[in-house]
């Protein structure tokens, strides 16, 4: 080994990564909100919709105070990976009715992938465990009907909206602990 030499700083550090994750989450939340509103305009929802394959909401307002960095990042990453799978499925199997929303769904998927990469980078830099999702991946079959795919889209966008909403709060809280 040669004599000690310094390394130039790389483009970001864990705190900058966390800032970047907050910004990406906020912009993804805005996109999701807008897309959900478009869905409601084009295909009015009759009540709340759910999908068994979607993750259950990780946090409530009451539990925000007790959040720990590893738990939040791990859970957020696993949940967002699930939503990414569901968005990919919607784009693939959503049928003609959802084709009009293809550009928006494509942009949403790209942003989701970018946020997941940023979270992974943050977890790597902090050296936090990054276990792959342990719950079995539920195979997503084709929707039973055109209306089935619309109901699924409502459920996916609604769930993603709630997940991103707690994610922004959680990440902002974690910034004070890093």
């Amino acid at each position: 080994p040669g004599p000690p030499a310094g390394s130039p700083r790389v483009s970001s550090d864990p705190r900058a990564d966390l800032d970047s994750a907050v910004l990406l989450t906020r912009s993804l939340l805005a996109d999701t909100r807008q897309l959900a509103a478009q869905m409601r305009d084009k295909f009015p929802a009759d009540g709340d919709h759910s999908l068994d394959s979607l993750p259950t909401l990780a946090m409530s307002a009451g539990t925000l105070g007790s959040l720990q960095l590893p738990g939040v990042l791990t859970r957020l990453r696993v949940d967002l990976m699930s939503y990414l799978r569901h968005v990919q499925w919607l784009r693939r199997a959503g049928g003609p009715s959802l084709k009009t929303l293809e550009p928006e769904l494509g942009a949403l998927q790209a942003r989701l992938e970018r946020l997941l990469r940023r979270l992974q980078l943050l977890m790597s830099r902090l050296a936090l465990p990054q276990a792959a999702p342990d719950q079995p991946v539920i195979p997503l079959g084709p929707p039973a009907s055109a209306w089935g795919s619309i109901r699924a889209a409502h459920a996916i966008l609604g769930g993603l909206h709630l997940t991103l909403d707690w994610a922004v709060r959680g990440l902002l809280l974690l910034k004070t602990r890093l």
Epitope: S7, P14, R125, L126, A127, L128, Q130, A132
Partner: antibody
Framework: EVQLLESGGGLVQPGGSLRLSCAAS????????MHWVRQAPGKGLEWVSV????????YYADSVKGRFTISRDNSKNTLYLQMNSLRAEDTAVYYC???????WGQGTLVTVSS | QSVLTQPPSASGTPGQRVTISCTGS?????????VHWYQQLPGTAPKLLIY???ERPSGVPDRFSGSKSGTSASLAISGLRSEDEADYYC???????????FGGGTKLTVL
């Protein structure tokens, strides 16, 4: 400028012990996970161990599990590797690295031989 | 035997474009874990070249680029220069280890 400076390497007999240190400067040490990665003469890189930014998580390669212990002192910006029951196959340059790893030290040579 | 597979050697002439591949499995690269690339010049420590599949740290020339698809990744070097002669390693997170795994390294020769 980021600096990682390893020390503590040297010649040791099989079964012996060594403690490596890595002094960090130029970045927020307490915000980074830290790794030890080694490279045997003429060979590739082999990850050895990692410790999370706050010291709460520690993981080891199977080849060193139970023999090596990683630790850190964030107040001193220093990373450590306690190596016990050393074997000939542990002979390598040991690098301390931060983050992804993003930053690497210049390495310290550990030779295990009788 | 490395968990990530790289060709042991690659070569090219100055100005050429060379590509180095890195093949993993469904438990590392294929599971969505990002790939990072390191350059190790003779007698020196490794240096981060590409992180998160295709991002360049500041100071790394844009002649270096990375990509990832499925269980594989690749590093491309365009406008090859003599100073690019080095060993190149890919790395990805391995959830079973909770640490990174490295490829066996590729020795790049500039002819």
């Amino acid at each position: 400028e980021v600096q990682l400076l390893e020390s503590g390497g040297g010649l040791v007999q099989p079964g012996g012990s060594l403690r490596l240190s890595c002094a960090a400067s130029g970045f927020t040490f307490s915000s980074y996970g830290m790794h030890w990665v080694r490279q045997a003469p003429g060979k590739g890189l082999e990850w050895v161990s990692v410790i999370s930014y706050d010291g709460s998580y520690k993981y080891y390669a199977d080849s060193v599990k139970g023999r090596f212990t990683i630790s850190r002192d964030n107040s001193k910006n220093t990373l450590y590797l306690q190596m016990n029951s050393l074997r000939a196959e542990d002979t390598a340059v040991y690098y301390c690295a931060a983050g992804v790893p993003d930053y690497w030290g210049q390495g310290t040579l550990v030779t295990v031989s009788s | 035997q490395s968990v990530l597979t790289q060709p042991p050697s690659a070569s090219g002439t100055p100005g050429q474009r060379v590509t180095i591949s890195c093949t993993g499995s469904s438990s590392n690269i294929g599971a969505g874990y990002d790939v990072h690339w390191y350059q190790q010049l003779p007698g020196t420590a490794p240096k981060l070249l590409i992180y998160s599949n295709n991002e360049r740290p500041s100071g790394v020339p844009d002649r270096f680029s990375g990509s990832k698809s499925g269980t594989s990744a690749s590093l491309a070097i365009s406008g090859l220069r003599s100073e690019d002669e080095a060993d190149y390693y890919c790395a990805a997170w391995d959830p079973s280890l909770n640490g990174p795994v490295f490829g066996g390294g590729t020795k790049l020769t500039v002819l």
